[in-house]
Interface confidence: low
Amino acid sequence: QEFLLRVEPQNPVLSAGGSLFVNCSTDCPSSEKIALETSLSKELVASGMGWAAFNLSNVTGNSRILCSVYCNGSQITGSSNITVYRLPERVELAPLPPWQPVGQNFTLRCQVEDGSPRTSLTVVLLRWEEELSRQPAVEEPAEVTATVLASRDDHGAPFSCRTELDMQPQGLGLFVNTSAPRQLRTFVLPVTPPRLVAPRFLEVETSWPVDCTLDGLFPASEAQVYLALGDQMLNATVMNHGDTLTATATATARADQEGAREIVCNVTLGGERREARENLTVFSFLGPIVNLSEPTAHEGSTVTVSCMAGARVQVTLDGVPAAAPGQPAQLQLNATESDDGRSFFCSATLEVDGEFLHRNSSVQLRVLYGPKIDRATCPQHLKWKDKTRHVLQCQARGNPYPELRCLKEGSSREVPVGIPFFVNVTHNGTYQCQASSSRGKYTLVVVMDIEAGSSH
């Protein structure tokens, strides 16, 4: 008769590091002590006639256990295969590029360490919850890749890696591990440079707006803009409208920046840069400053008028040019009454990169001269009719402007000057018309001959 040796449980599945209770039993009536052969750590828990129970601890790998017993002098055996399952220790998605150009491929890489049995382990690459790739885990560590074409919609999308250990056929379920997600940033940076609108010339200590625009940028809000005048960074205000970025700044030129300079606009996105440069000339245009040696001159004195401006500036004073650019223009005159109120004009011209810039300035001369009464406008003999309306048309001139009064000789009677009045016979007589100012007096005799009206 053939006797059997049973090993229970048959082909068990357990989690790595776990323990297993094993029972070996035989129907042989004259069996000896049952032995368990295994490389695992074992302990005899109990035994009896034809049976023995063992505890296997810290089961870390797949193993085959063998029970044996001698029955009537011959050895009988029974075996069981232990399958150990282990969840992956590490599931990691490799870092994504810091920025990924839209329309170009990038690679997702997932590394899986440990995890068994390998035949039941699958690696899945995901965008959001969408499966991009599903592959078996093969080597140790397992590395799974997928190539993805970047799109605008991928900007900000989380990518992750998931492992699935399928122990459902063994009645243990599906064990899932997921990596930490990584967020992708995609971008579009056109090959065209930005449009830079800047002045060709900029005067020292003046300000001018500078605009830099780039279209077709995505995401425009993430772009960095650098605007500079020479090595002076400009404080730019950046606005986004859809896929258009506009940076606006005010360029103020300093004195130490005079000469040929560049305005530069750099737009950086995704580690790439687009640049526009415009030449600009920073210039200094001082003046023109017109000076009088005496702003208020005495009649007969010599007055020097000079006009000056900055270096390289050509000045012309009342039509007379300076000897050379950067030199002052001068003229001298003997101050006369006719020069009072005279304006002297100075024009300044600066050539900046082939363009001529013009500025003007003027100054007015005051000449102090004594009072005069213009005989041509002040008749010395007047023949008027009694009871008629007339104007004594006398005008005085001088600087300071004189006061003009006409007084009748031998009395303090005054006739108005330049104002209409009624003439009567009492106005008959000789008048002293006197113009007076701080610079002296001037007298003119005017005779009024009043004809009495005919009596009816």
Partner: antibody, heavy 119, light 113 residues
Amino acid sequence: EIQLQQTGPELVKPGASVKISCKASGYSFTDCIILWVKQSHGKGLEWIGKINPYFGTTTYNLKFKGKATLTVDKSSSTAHMQLNSLTSEDSAVYYCARKEAYPDAMDYWGQGTSVTVSS
Amino acid sequence: DAVMTQTPLSLPVSLGDQASISCRSSQSLVHSNGDTYLHWYLQKPGQSPQLLIYKVSNRFSGVPDRFGSGSGSGTDFTLKLSRVEAEDLGVYFCSQSTHVPYTFGGGTKLEIK
């Protein structure tokens, strides 16, 4: 960590030239201005000039124009200063420093290079 | 050039004391953009200068708050230390970058009494 590493001390003969270097690390070299400063016993600190590594543009103190020439090598993030026609007056410690557009002050300095002019 | 004059030349103090250094410029340091580019540096013995205060009153990162008050405007500026510590000893320089060439003060040596 932002660092400016300067070359070692130099002993040179009168009339000769010397080129001292300043290697930048810990930041984007082209984003900041590099300046050079002279420190001598008699005259304290004197600003020599500055260079914008991105564009290569320079501004000099007129006192050092013709004496100092500032250059950069963007590929190695290094700024150089050549001093010509050396005399004993040029014996000093020379520092490189950097400044950002803001705060517009020399926020990090090299350790200094001692130049001794002697026959 | 803008000439920077510092007073005093030497400032003996006891640890824990307050210290005040003055800096005067021969011309206004107010730039046409409205900013004043006056800075303070400290050079400790055997070291390079280090930035303490930029644009009159702004403490550079990592500078202790006992370097609390840079003040002044136009041509007159002051640096105040509230409680002097041993590590504060050295030469203090003011410097301007409003006008080219940039210029430095002659320095004030802070030393123990």
